[in-house]
């Protein structure tokens, strides 16, 4: 059976505050717990959600949380269900509202000596107590012809007189808290002797040297006085006018006329009405001088035929706000049609080529008129003057491909080579007219070229194939000086290309024929076994029908390649002793020996007193120091080849003999001792 360890209980709650309905169950099997509100399942929200098996409220809501909550537990194995006791909230709240007129039905019906009732629309639970205020001052019950009914939340004024005029507000407080009226009520009960506005002056904008008129009227019993003041508090009367208002006239009905208005007349004019009783009424109006600024420039516009485009005319700053209109060819544009004005915009729908031209935006107000032109170009799709042609270009010379087109505006031309955009560099140049120049034609320039000519209206393209007429040339040119190893097999290659496959042959420079052990096989000179006599000058000749012949001269040297007779060995030397690194090489021509120590060539002329290189190639280092340790490389070279061999040199401290060691004990390393 399911047992409730903790049941939810009814409780007080505060609107908008946290609350928790507890529910804890115990059952033999797994239990599923959910909540009901008035018999319907409660869905989790951010405001109200299950917390374990309890129901948590982040902010109690008097409308959504009113009703009966019940916790339901279901044993998932047996299906048994148990329900908790019902629980509900006693929600305490207070909510602000306006002060409204309850009696009479409308403000227009409020007359002196009638009863006026105001209601305070602040509500809450428990019912709050109310306090009324006039112009911020508390009103106490039963004083000065008014009564407060807390039950109905009403304030009654009987009878209402001018002394009750003012701003009425209310506040209410309860156990939950306090609230004041969200909107207050202004009660205005006229006193006949107070000045009342009949006609208030309005702001005026006038052009320079024009006239301006302000109207102003008050009424009262007896009639009120009326006075005009300018900004600096100078009174304006027909008898005494300030110097800068010589052309001002005050009429019997209170109107003020200013003629030939100048900039110094601009400013605030005050009309003051004073009744026999009550405060003066001050009404203000401003005289502005009309003005208009210059218009910003338009950028020229390029549009495409068939599209719809808009050009916005920003009106210049001005007072009053300038009116704006568009003209074309001296005619004002209509407000509908294919080319028309909409607001401040020029609209061109389904643009035609004939729409191109100058359009003018006009702006005008009392201060004058301004205009600004915009040049509209209607773009056309390019057409061909000369397409690129399939071309034969000579290798090594400049080559040209044409792409001549015309359109409005001037078209942009781009070139592609094998579908890749050609960017201008030292080899390619695109002229203003669209022609492509290839500065020095290479064999691999033989491919497809495509030019595209574009305007905003569209593009056209054409392609052409370039065939490169190859030069007759050696590929690669043979090395002018080459070595062959004595008594070994050797080959000397020579190859060439041209418009036609060239024939290649070798001959000796002196014109003598090649010995029988030397063969010329398709341009490769082959020596079966090199002899001393094979040294000399040879010529490789490449020729074809259309391009004639070319020659390359090669001097062949026969050499005995370098071998080392003596190579340096790994050497360990006591600090302060002398190190000897031996190196001897043989070959023909006789090799020269150089040493490299610690990644730098040891220049024999700059070795210093501690180092010396012997004629036979050996390197000696006197008074060795730890910094002499490292790898030493012996490099043997002649005009035909180069070989190197290396060995490490270790410099160590001389050990101090220990008692236990006999006088004849050997050192711990293989040493050179000097």
């Amino acid at each position: 059976a399911i047992v409730f360890i903790k049941q939810p209980s009814s409780q007080d709650a505060l609107q908008g505050r946290r609350a928790l309905l507890r529910c804890e169950v115990e059952a033999p099997g797994p239990v599923h717990v959910y909540w009901l509100l008035d018999g319907a399942p409660v869905q989790d929200t951010e405001r109200r959600f299950a917390q374990g098996s309890s129901l948590s409220f982040a902010a109690v809501d008097r409308l959504q949380d009113s009703g009966t909550f019940q916790c339901v537990a279901r044993d998932d194995v047996t299906g048994e269900e148990a329900r908790s006791a019902n629980a509900s909230f006693n929600i305490k709240w207070i909510e602000a509202g306006p002060v409204v007129l309850k009696h009479p039905a409308s403000e227009a019906e409020i007359q002196p000596q009638t009863q006026v009732t105001l209601r305070c629309h602040i509500d809450g639970h428990p019912r709050p107590t109310y306090q009324w205020f006039r112009d911020g001052t508390p009103l106490s019950d039963g004083q000065s012809n008014h009564t407060v009914s807390s039950k109905e939340r009403n304030l009654t004024l009987r009878p209402a007189g001018p002394e009750h005029s003012g701003l009425y507000s209310c506040c209410a407080h309860s156990a939950f808290g306090q609230a004041c009226s969200s909107q207050n009520f202004t009660l205005s009960i006229a006193d006949e002797s107070f000045a009342r506005v009949v006609l208030a002056p309005q702001d005026v904008v006038v052009a320079r040297y024009e006239e301006a008129m302000f109207h102003c009227q008050f009424s009262a019993q007896p009639p009120p006085s009326l006075q005009w003041l300018f900004e600096d508090e100078t009174p304006i009367t027909n008898r005494s006018r300030p110097p800068h208002l010589r052309r001002a006239t005050v009429f019997a009905n209170g109107s003020l006329l200013l003629t030939q208005v100048r900039p110094r007349n601009a400013g605030i004019y005050r009309c003051i009405g004073q009744g026999q009783r009550g405060p003066p009424i001050i009404l203000e109006a401003t005289l502005h001088l009309a003005e208009i600024e210059d218009m910003p420039l338009f950028e020229p516009r390029v549009f495409t035929a068939g599209s719809e485009e808009r050009v916005t005319c920003l009106p210049p700053k001005g007072l009053p706000e300038p009116s704006v209109w568009w003209e074309h060819a001296g005619v004002r544009l209509p407000t509908h049609g294919r080319v028309y004005q909409k607001g401040h915009e020029l609209v061109l729908a389904n643009i035609a080529e004939s729409d191109a031209g100058v359009y003018t935006c006009h702006a005008a107000n009392l201060a004058g008129q301004r205009r600004q032109d915009v040049n509209i170009t209607v773009a056309t799709v390019p057409s061909w003057l000369k397409k690129p042609q399939d071309s034969q270009l000579e290798e090594g010379k400049p080559g040209y491909l044409d792409c001549l087109t015309q359109a409005t505006p001037k078209p942009t031309v781009v070139w592609y080579r094998n579908q890749m955009l050609i960017s201008e560099d030292s080899r390619f140049e695109v002229f203003k007219n669209g022609t492509l120049r290839i500065n020095s034609v290479e064999v691999y320039d033989g491919t497809w070229y495509r030019c595209m000519s574009s305007t905003p209206a569209g593009s056209i393209e054409a392609q052409a194939r370039v065939q490169v007429l190859e030069k007759l040339k050696f590929t690669p040119p043979p090395q002018p000086q080459q070595c062959m190893e004595f008594d070994k097999e050797a080959t000397v290659p020579c190859s060439a290309t041209g418009r036609e496959k060239p024939t290649i042959k070798w001959e000796r420079a002196d014109g003598s024929s090649l010995p029988e052990w030397v063969t010329d096989n398709a341009g490769t000179l082959h020596f079966a076994r090199v002899t001393r006599d094979d040294a000399g000058n040879y010529t490789c000749i490449a020729s074809n029908g259309p391009q004639g012949q070319i020659r390359a001269h090669v001097q062949l040297t026969v050499a005995v390649f370098i071998t080392f007779k003596v190579e340096p060995e790994r050497t360990t030397v006591y600090q302060g002793h002398t190190a000897l690194l031996q190196c001897e090489a043989q070959g023909d021509p006789k090799p020269l020996i150089q040493w490299k120590g610690k990644d730098r060539i040891l220049d024999p002329t700059k070795l210093g007193p501690r180092m010396h290189i012997f004629q036979n190639g050996s390197l000696v280092i006197h008074d060795v120091a730890p910094e002499d340790s490292g790898r030493y490389t012996c490099i043997a070279g002649n005009s035909c080849n180069i070989k190197h061999t290396e060995a490490p040199l270790y410099v160590v401290d001389k050990p101090v003999p220990e008692e236990s060691e006999g006088p004849g004990s050997p050192p711990p390393y293989k040493m050179i001792q000097t």
Epitope: G39, R74, D76, T78, G79, R83
Partner: antibody, heavy 113, light 107 residues
Framework: QVQLVQSGAEVKKPGASVKISCKGS????????MHWLKQAPGQGLEWIGV????????NYNQKFQGRATMTVDKSISTAYMELSRLRSDDTAVYYC??????WGQGTLVTVSS | DVQITQSPSYLSASPGDRITITCRAS??????LAWYQQKPGKANKLLIY???TLQSGVPSRFSGSGSGTEFTLTISSLQPEDFAMYYC?????????FGQGTKVEIK
């Protein structure tokens, strides 16, 4: 002893509705939740939802929300499950179960044009 | 929704064999996994719930273990009446979800 007896097999056309019943006996009907499950031919089991007969409050599997409707008639201790807008993939055996421990014998619903 | 993956789909064994069936959940379901036996023409039978609690009347050769996402059903010594379809089901949250089933056949 606890018994759940379901209504007989049904053959329906696509777009129609079917209403299956499940009568509980041998226990207090309103004190136990009733689950409904589906098993398509050669397939596993799918949970449709659960109804609490006491108030009639329900919890549906999102997959069946809007097409399945679970109700109870407390006076005759019977639970019902109606499936609307039938499709061919609704062909299955439908089970009612009191919790996980007691199952009905199942009702075969065939949807075919 | 919690996905349940059951393996193997088929299992051949002989009477007296010890067998295990595994279920894996796509997220932690604490200990709340149940095991059922299904035979044609018979009502589904609950064997184990809450991972390892034996339903009353179920022989002790059936046992369950695991928590979180990994669970197993073990039948220590298969009897002839144990050859059937077995399903696992999570009951940690609604909607209940089931494994695809394991058919235990006679070898």
């Amino acid at each position: 002893q606890v018994q759940l007896v379901q209504s007989g097999a049904e053959v329906k056309k696509p777009g129609a509705s079917v209403k299956i019943s499940c009568k509980g006996s041998g226990y207090t009907f309103t004190d136990y939740g009733m689950h409904w499950l589906k098993q398509a031919p050669g397939q596993g089991l799918e949970w449709i939802g659960v109804i609490s007969p006491y108030y009639g409050d329900v919890n549906y599997n999102q997959k069946f929300q809007g097409r399945a409707t679970m109700t109870v008639d407390k006076s005759i201790s019977t639970a019902y499950m109606e499936l609307s807008r039938l499709r061919s993939d609704d062909t299955a055996v439908y089970y009612c179960a009191r919790g996980m421990g007691y199952w009905g014998q199942g009702t075969l619903v065939t949807v075919s044009s | 929704d919690v996905q349940i993956t059951q393996s193997p789909s088929y299992l051949s064994a002989s009477p007296g064999d010890r067998i295990t069936i595994t279920c894996r959940a796509s997220q932690s379901i604490s200990k709340y996994l149940a095991w059922y036996q299904q035979k044609p023409g018979k009502a589904n039978k609950l064997l184990i719930y809450s991972g390892s609690t034996l339903q009353s009347g179920v022989p002790s050769r059936f046992s369950g273990s695991g928590s979180g996402t990994e669970f197993t059903l073990t039948i220590s010594s298969l009897q002839p009446e144990d050859f059937a379809m077995y399903y696992c089901q999570q009951h940690n949250e609604y909607p209940w979800t089931f494994g695809q089933g394991t058919k235990v056949e006679i070898k």
